[in-house]
């Protein structure tokens, strides 16, 4: 088992990258002098206790920033949030911390990230640029749920 996070960069099919702005992740077109975030990801060590064939359950964080992506309900709506959290603290817990877990599925070069806590809800960006990352259950034209994940070695 790999027990250190892997690092990666993410962009969507419109070549927008993830940028941290006021503790919020937004997707913007790549430009010079821009600093896209580097993703830290690590597979859940309790994979056998999670659903099979849904993807690889992973914790997703921002490399070097002690921030992790999580899903929580605001009212009745699952929302995507950034929480101050060491990704290895999550990895080492005695049970999967589902609010911080995502099923990572790959099809060709495309990756999707489905919330483990809220099945059927995916990390997405609006088709319009400069918008925060969200969770959506509508896999259509309004939102992009397919991302390109490039691992950095």
């Amino acid at each position: 088992k790999i027990d250190t996070p892997q690092r990666g960069s993410i962009q969507d099919i419109n070549h927008r990258v993830w940028v941290l702005q006021d503790q919020t992740l937004i997707a913007v077109p790549r430009k010079d002098r821009m600093s896209p975030v580097t993703i830290a990801l690590i597979s859940c060590r309790h994979v056998e206790t999670l659903e099979k064939d849904r993807g690889n359950p992973i914790y997703l964080g921002l490399n070097g920033l002690n921030l992790c992506l999580m899903c929580a309900k605001v009212g009745d709506q699952p929302t995507l949030q950034l929480k101050e959290k060491d990704i290895m603290d999550l990895y080492n817990q005695p049970e999967p911390v589902k609010s911080f877990l995502f099923y990572h599925s790959q099809s060709g070069r495309n990756s999707t990230f489905e919330s483990v806590a809220f099945p059927g809800w995916f990390i997405a960006v609006s088709s319009e640029g400069g918008c925060p990352l969200i969770l959506t259950q509508e896999l259509g034209k309004a939102n992009t749920t397919d991302f390109g994940l490039t691992m950095l070695f």
Epitope: E48, T49, L50, D89, P94, E95, P96, V97, S99, A117
Partner: antibody
Framework: QVQLVQSGAEVKKPGASVKVSCKAS????????IHWVRQAPGQGLEWIGR????????RYDPKFQGRATITTDTSTSTVYLEFSSLRSEDTAVYYC??????????????WGQGTLVTVSS | QAVVTQEPSLTVSPGGTVTLTCRSS?????????ANWVQQKPGQAFAGLIG???DRAPGVPARFSGSLLGGKAALTISGAQPEDEADYFC?????????FGGGTKLTVL
């Protein structure tokens, strides 16, 4: 408020099976893990196993693997422990407990009132 | 499989400080054992006190604190109250299962 309410006391003969229930209220059972623990007379606590009610996956102490079966009915927010091939040494109070993630860690925060299972010929 | 051992009984004076410990037969207890402490008062259900070695559960008074002490998990009650008279159990995590201790009966006298 959060509550775990267990079924009533049972008397069983050696070799029989028993099924104990634990009904949850005041929280969404799918957001936590439900564990079963037992306490024999004058003894400490003994962990039996747990279930993830959202998915149905289980873990068991190797000692109880094969004799204990934990299931859930999310429509009624109820978790069950079935214990088979009972012997006199299985006489104990059986407890369900919620293992809940809060802040930075998991806590065995809420427990059922216990179900006494007596195994006697 | 590890055996987890606690002091069978301890006594503390009201307002005094007492430390309960939790030892593992498999070696030193570490933060990777995610020590939990639960309390059972006479005639009441169990209630969680500590998780993750030193995190207090919501609503637990600050006089309860968890730590590691000499290779053991420890629960310290500072300024013990009469209502702290109870049985206390620790639980340690070992890779894929939990092991509970035999419990400590605490008398506040």
């Amino acid at each position: 408020q959060v509550q775990l309410v267990q079924s009533g006391a049972e008397v069983k003969k050696p070799g029989a099976s028993v099924k104990v229930s634990c009904k949850a209220s005041g929280f969404n059972i799918k957001d936590t893990y439900i564990h079963w623990v037992r306490q024999a007379p004058g003894q400490g606590l003994e962990w039996i196993g747990r279930i993830d009610p959202a998915i149905g996956t289980t873990r068991y102490d190797p000692k109880f693997q094969g004799r204990a079966t934990i299931t859930t009915d999310t429509s009624t927010s109820t978790v069950y422990l079935e214990f088979s091939s009972l012997r006199s040494e299985d006489t104990a109070v059986y407890y369900c407990a919620r293992l809940h993630y809060f802040g930075n860690n998991f806590f065995f925060d809420y427990w059922g009132q216990g179900t006494l299972v007596t195994v006697s010929s | 499989q590890a055996v987890v051992t606690q002091e069978p009984s301890l006594t503390v004076s009201p307002g005094g400080t007492v430390t309960l410990t939790c030892r593992s037969s498999s070696g030193a207890v570490t933060t990777s054992n995610y020590a939990n402490w639960v309390q059972q008062k006479p005639g009441q259900a169990f209630a969680g006190l500590i998780g993750g070695t030193n995190d207090r559960a919501p609503g637990v008074p600050a006089r309860f604190s968890g730590s590691l002490l000499g290779g053991k998990a420890a629960l310290t009650i500072s300024g013990a109250q009469p209502e702290d008279e109870a049985d206390y159990f620790c639980a340690l995590w070992f890779s894929n299962h939990w092991v509970f201790g035999g419990g400590t009966k605490l008398t506040v006298l």
